[in-house]
C-alpha cells in the first residue's frame, strides 16, 4: 500500500536499521526509498523541546508487518517509503537548506559568488555529496563566500546543525546534471585502487548499476563466474581513487571494469530486469510460494515489498500441477549473500525500483504541416487519445509525463462528459494500428485548469490520470518537464508532433508526424496576434514565412525541445491562426508556468499530508525548482 | 614544508617607522589569507591585521592599530608585510605573521618564529 | 567584538593527569573556535580546529569539545612536553579575530 503522506508529531517505535542525518523529512523519505531494507522512517525536526542533537536525525526502520506502532512525539515526523508506490521518485534534490550547516569531510574549500555556483562545483567534482556555502552576511570575514565541498562514507551529513547566514545543499550529479561521464565498459581488464564496498552481482551491468548508486562508488572491477579463483566468482568491487579516476589497470582474463553512471545525463534506473538462467541468489529467506514460470516469480517478488531478489526452481515433471517453487528472498544490501550456477535454478530481482525512474533523462534515438513521418520510438512521449462517442476517433495528442499521467490540452474536452468515453494509445506511431483488440490506457479523471474558459485566453491544460499505470519501455515513456530553473534557457531545437492536418482542410494522418519549429519570442508573436493577449503563459512556434505548424488533431499534443540533450516539454499544442499561414504562429500552452500545477495535482492530496510550512522544524526551502521533472514525490 | 620567517624588528623610538616582512614558501601564498599577531611581553595574543587573498581591497585592522599599520603582500615574490608607522610604547612585541585556512572554520594553521619590535625613547 | 575569557588562568599538575581548561565567548560563536599551545620562546601550534577537530599531527591524548559559548580543551594523561600556555580563539564573528587570555599550565 503506498502512503505518500507525512505523519506530523508522529513516531515509529521500534524497527531501527540505521540513523542518518537528513536536511528534511522529504528527503529522510527519498534516503529511506533508496535503502535496501528501509520501509518507515522517522524524522526529527528542529524544536525547543527536541535536544539539538536529535535535530535533522533520520532513522531508517524496517518492520516485517510493514508497519509498526505509532507514538505522539513533537518534532517528529514520521512517514512510509515510497517503495510500496507506483509513481516515479528521484534522488535528485535540488532545495537549498537556509541556516543549516550540513557536516562532513570538508575536502575543498573556494570562493565562491554564490551558492548556486557552489552547488555546480559539488556536481561537477567527482567526490562531493553536499556543500556548505557561507553566504556574504556570515559573520567570518575570512569564511564569507566560502564555498565548503563535503563527502562522507554514507553520502548524507555525518550531523547537521544550525548556523546562521551559511546554506547548505546536496551534489546535483543524480539529477543528470554533470558532465564527467564515462560509459565504456572494458573487457578482460581489472582495476586497482580502494575498494569501498564488494557484493555479489550475476554481471557486470547489475555491477555498474550498484556503483552507480553507491555513495562513494567511482568505477568498478567484476570477477566472472568464470574467474580463476571460485571464491571471488561473481564478486562486484566497487572502488575509488583520490584522483577520481583508476590510477592503474591489469588485463586480467574474465574480468569487466567500468565507471558509475552518476555522471552521465541518461542515469541508469535503479533495477534490474533480467533474468539470470541455470543461477541461484542466496539469501535470507522471506517465503516460499508456488508459481507458473519465473516472470510470475519476479512479479511475486516485486509485489512483496520486502522482497529484494528470488531464484525460482521450475516444477519437476507432473507436479504440483506444472508450478515450480519461488523463493523470495532479501539481504542487508538488496544483493545475493551467495550466487550459484549450475542447478537450475532462475534467479532476478524485485522491479519495485524501476520506478525510481531517475532524474529526466528521455534522449532521442541513435501530423504537422510540413513535416514528416516519425520513427517509431522517436516520440515515446506523444500519445494519442481517442473518443468512442459516437464513433471511435482520434481526438488529441498528448504527453506522458509520469506512469499514470498524461498532459494534453484543455480544449479537447470540449462536449466530453465523462472519462470512461476516453482512450490513450502510448507507443503508437500509426493510427491504422489501432485495432479492436489493441491495448489503450482507461482514464480514470480529467483535471482540467479551473480558470480555462477557451484555448486563447490561456490555462490551456488538462491532465488526464490513468486507471492503470504505463510500464515504461523504449517506444512509451515519459518526457520532462521543463525547470524552473530553466525559464531562461533559449531552446533551439524543438518538435512539434501529432498525427493532425497537413493543411487546414485535410484528415487526421496515419503516421505520426515532425515538424522542427523555431521558438518566437512573446512580444513578437504579439504582434502577430492584436486581437488577442499573448501571456508569459503562453509560448509560440512557428516560421516568419509559414510552411511548418500544428493543426487541427494536433491539439493536446507536445513542443518537445531538446536541451542538453535531454527532451523537455516545453509547450502543449492550443491554438493558432490557421495552419502553417504565413506570419501566425502557433500558440502553446508554455509547460514551465505550470509545473507548480502538475505537481499539486498529481500528488494526492491526502489527510494528514503536511507542507512545509506546517513543519515548524522543517527549514525554509529555497528551491530552484519543486518539481523534480517528471517525478510526482 | 610551509614556512613563513619574519625579518625587519629592531628597537625603533616612538612616533618613527618600521616595516616588517614575512617570506613565505612551501604553499601556494597567493591563495591565502595571511595574518599578522603580536604578543607583547610576558602578555597573550592580539590579532593585529589581515590580507584576503581573493580580494585586494580586503585589508583588515585591529582598532589598535588602524590608521597607523599598512598590510601589503607582493604574490609575485610570496611576500607579506606590514608598513607601522606612528609607532607608540605599547606596540612593543614579538610580531607573528601567520597564514590562514580555512579547516571547517578559519584558523592560523602555519606561524612564523616571529619578530622582536621593541618601541622605546 | 566577542570576548573570550579562559579559566583558569594557570594551573599546576603532574605528568599523567587529566586537565581541562575551558573557555567562554561572550556571545554564541557556534563551533567556530580553536586552540593553540605556546612554548617559551616559539610560536603558537594549532592543535584543535572547530572546537572538536585535531589537527594533523596533534596527539591523540587533545581534545576539544562545546558549541556555542562554552568550551573546553582536555588532555588525557599529560607528557612533559605539554607544559606550555594553551590560548582559544573565536573566527566566527570577525574582524576582529580574538584570544582568550591564556592558561599557563605549569608542572606541580
Known amino acids: 500500500e503506498c502512503v505518500t503522506q507525512l505523519l506530523k508529531d508522529t513516531c515509529f517505535e521500534g524497527g531501527d536499521i540505521t540513523t542518518v542525518f537528513t536536511p528534511s523529512a522529504k528527503y529522510c523519505q527519498v534516503v529511506c526509498t533508496y535503502h535496501p531494507r528501509c520501509l518507515l522512517f522517522t524524522f526529527t525536526a528542529e524544536s525547543p523541546s527536541e535536544d539539538p542533537t536529535r535535530w535533522f536525525t533520520c532513522v531508517l526502520k524496517d518492520s516485517v508487518t510493514e508497519t509498526l506502532p505509532r507514538v505522539n512525539r513533537t518534532a517528529a515526523i514520521s512517514g512510509y517509503s515510497f517503495k510500496q508506490c507506483s509513481h516515479q521518485i528521484s534522488a535528485c534534490n535540488k532545495d537549498i537548506y537556509v541556516d543549516l550547516d550540513m557536516k562532513g569531510i570538508n575536502y575543498n574549500s573556494s570562493v565562491a559568488k554564490s551558492a548556486q555556483e557552489c552547488q555546480e562545483r559539488c556536481t561537477d567534482d567527482v567526490h562531493c555529496h553536499f556543500f556548505t556555502y557561507a553566504t556574504r552576511q556570515f559573520p567570518s570575514l575570512e569564511h564569507r563566500n566560502i564555498c565548503l565541498l563535503k563527502h562522507t562514507q554514507t553520502g548524507t551529513p555525518t550531523r547537521i546543525t544550525k548556523l546562521d547566514k551559511v546554506v547548505s545543499g546536496f551534489s546535483l550529479k543524480s539529477c543528470a546534471l554533470s558532465n564527467l561521464c564515462h560509459m565504456n565498459i572494458f573487457q578482460h581488464l581489472a582495476f586497482s585502487d580502494v575498494d569501498v564496498a564488494r557484493v555479489l552481482t550475476p554481471d557486470a551491468f547489475v555491477c555498474r548499476t550498484i556503483c552507480t548508486y553507491h555513495p562513494n562508488c567511482l568505477f568498478f572491477t567484476f570477477y566472472t563466474n568464470v574467474w580463476k579463483i571460485e571464491s571471488q566468482r561473481n564478486v562486484c568491487l566497487l572502488k575509488t581513487s583520490e584522483s577520481g579516476t583508476p590510477s592503474s589497470s591489469t588485463p586480467q582474463e574474465n574480468t569487466i571494469s567500468g565507471y558509475s553512471l552518476l555522471t552521465c545525463h541518461s542515469i541508469p534506473v535503479f533495477c534490474h530486469s533480467s533474468f539470470y538462467h541455470d543461477t541461484d541468489f542466496l539469501g535470507e529467506e522471506l517465503d516460499i510460494v508456488a508459481a507458473k514460470s519465473h516472470e510470475a516469480c519476479q512479479k511475486l517478488c516485486t509485489n512483496a515489498v520486502r522482497c529484494q531478489f528470488f531464484t525460482y526452481t521450475p516444477a519437476q515433471a507432473s507436479c504440483n500441477e506444472g508450478k515450480g517453487k519461488c523463493y523470495l528472498k532479501l539481504s542487508s544490501n538488496g544483493s545475493p549473500t551467495k550466487i550459484l550456477h549450475g542447478r537450475g535454478g532462475i534467479s532476478g530481482y524485485t522491479l519495485r525500483l524501476c520506478k525510481m525512474d531517475n532524474e529526466c533523462t528521455t534522449k532521442i534515438k541513435p501530423r504537422i504541416v510540413g513535416g514528416t513521418a516519425s520513427v517509431r520510438g522517436e516520440w515515446p512521449w506523444q500519445v494519442t487519445l481517442h473518443t468512442t462517442s459516437p464513433t471511435q476517433r482520434h481526438l488529441c495528442g498528448g504527453s506522458i509525463i509520469g506512469n499514470q499521467w498524461i498532459l494534453t490540452a484543455a480544449h479537447c474536452f470540449y462536449g466530453v462528459e465523462s472519462p470512461k468515453i476516453l482512450r490513450v494509445y502510448s507507443g503508437i506511431l500509426n493510427q491504422s494500428e489501432i485495432k479492436e483488440d489493441t491495448s489503450f490506457f482507461g482514464v480514470q479523471e480529467i483535471i482540467i485548469h479551473d480558470q480555462y474558459k477557451m484555448a486563447e485566453s490561456g490555462y490551456d491544460i488538462a491532465l488526464l490520470k490513468l486507471e492503470t499505470t504505463v510500464n515504461y519501455t523504449d517506444s512509451q515513456r515519459p518526457i520532462c518537464l521543463p525547470s524552473k530553473g530553466d525559464r531562461n534557457v533559449i531552446y533551439t531545437d524543438c518538435w512539434v508532433t501529432g498525427w493532425g492536418y497537413r493543411k487546414l482542410r485535410d484528415k487526421i494522418q496515419n503516421t505520426l508526424q515532425k515538424a522542427k519549429i523555431p521558438l518566437v519570442t512573446n512580444e513578437e508573436c504579439q504582434k502577430r496576434y492584436r486581437g488577442h493577449k499573448i501571456t508569459h503563459k503562453m509560448i509560440c512556434a512557428g516560421y516568419r514565412e509559414g510552411g511548418k505548424d500544428a493543426c487541427k488533431g494536433d491539439s493536446g499534443g507536445p513542443l518537445s525541445c531538446k536541451h542538453n540533450e535531454v527532451w523537455h516539454l516545453v509547450g502543449i499544442t492550443s491554438w493558432g491562426e490557421g495552419c502553417a499561414q504565413r506570419e501566425r504562429p502557433g500558440v502553446y500552452t508554455n509547460v514551465v508556468e505550470y509545473v507548480d500545477w502538475i505537481l499539486e495535482k498529481t500528488q494526492a492530496v491526502e489527510q494528514k499530508l503536511i507542507s512545509e510550512e506546517d513543519l515548524g522544524g522543517e527549514q525554509k526551502l529555497i528551491s530552484e525548482e519543486d518539481l523534480h521533472h517528471h517525478h510526482h514525490h | 614544508q610551509v614556512q613563513l620567517v619574519e625579518s625587519g624588528g629592531g628597537v625603533v623610538q616612538p612616533g618613527r617607522s618600521l616595516r616588517l616582512s614575512c617570506a613565505a614558501s612551501g604553499f601556494t601564498f597567493s591563495s591565502y589569507n595571511m595574518h599578522w599577531v603580536r604578543q607583547a611581553p610576558g602578555k597573550g595574543l592580539e590579532w593585529v591585521a589581515i590580507f584576503l587573498s581573493y580580494d585586494g581591497s580586503n585589508k583588515y585592522y585591529a582598532d589598535s592599530v588602524k590608521g597607523r599599520f599598512t598590510i601589503s603582500r607582493d604574490n609575485s615574490r610570496d611576500m607579506l608585510y606590514l608598513q607601522m608607522n606612528s609607532l607608540r610604547a605599547e606596540d612593543t612585541a614579538v610580531y607573528y605573521c601567520?597564514?590562514?585556512?580555512?579547516?571547517?572554520?578559519?584558523?592560523?594553521?602555519?606561524w612564523g618564529q616571529g619578530t622582536l619590535v621593541t618601541v622605546s625613547s | 567584538d566577542i570576548q573570550m575569557t579562559q579559566s583558569p588562568s594557570s594551573l599546576s599538575a603532574s605528568v599523567g593527569d587529566r586537565v581541562t581548561i575551558t573557555c567562554r565567548a561572550s556571545q554564541s560563536i557556534s563551533s567556530y573556535l580553536n586552540w593553540y599551545q605556546q612554548k617559551p620562546g616559539k610560536a603558537p601550534k594549532l592543535l584543535i580546529y572547530?572546537?572538536?577537530s585535531l589537527q594533523s599531527g596533534v596527539p591523540s591524548r587533545f581534545s576539544g569539545s562545546g558549541s556555542g559559548t562554552d568550551f573546553t580543551l582536555t588532555i588525557s594523561s599529560l607528557q612533559p612536553e605539554d607544559f606550555a600556555t594553551y590560548y582559544c580563539q573565536q573566527s566566527y564573528s570577525t574582524p576582529p579575530i580574538t584570544f582568550g587570555q591564556g592558561t599557563r599550565l605549569e608542572i606541580k
Open positions: 572547530a572546537a572538536s
Open positions: 601567520a597564514k590562514s585556512e580555512i579547516l571547517v572554520v578559519p584558523t592560523l594553521d602555519y
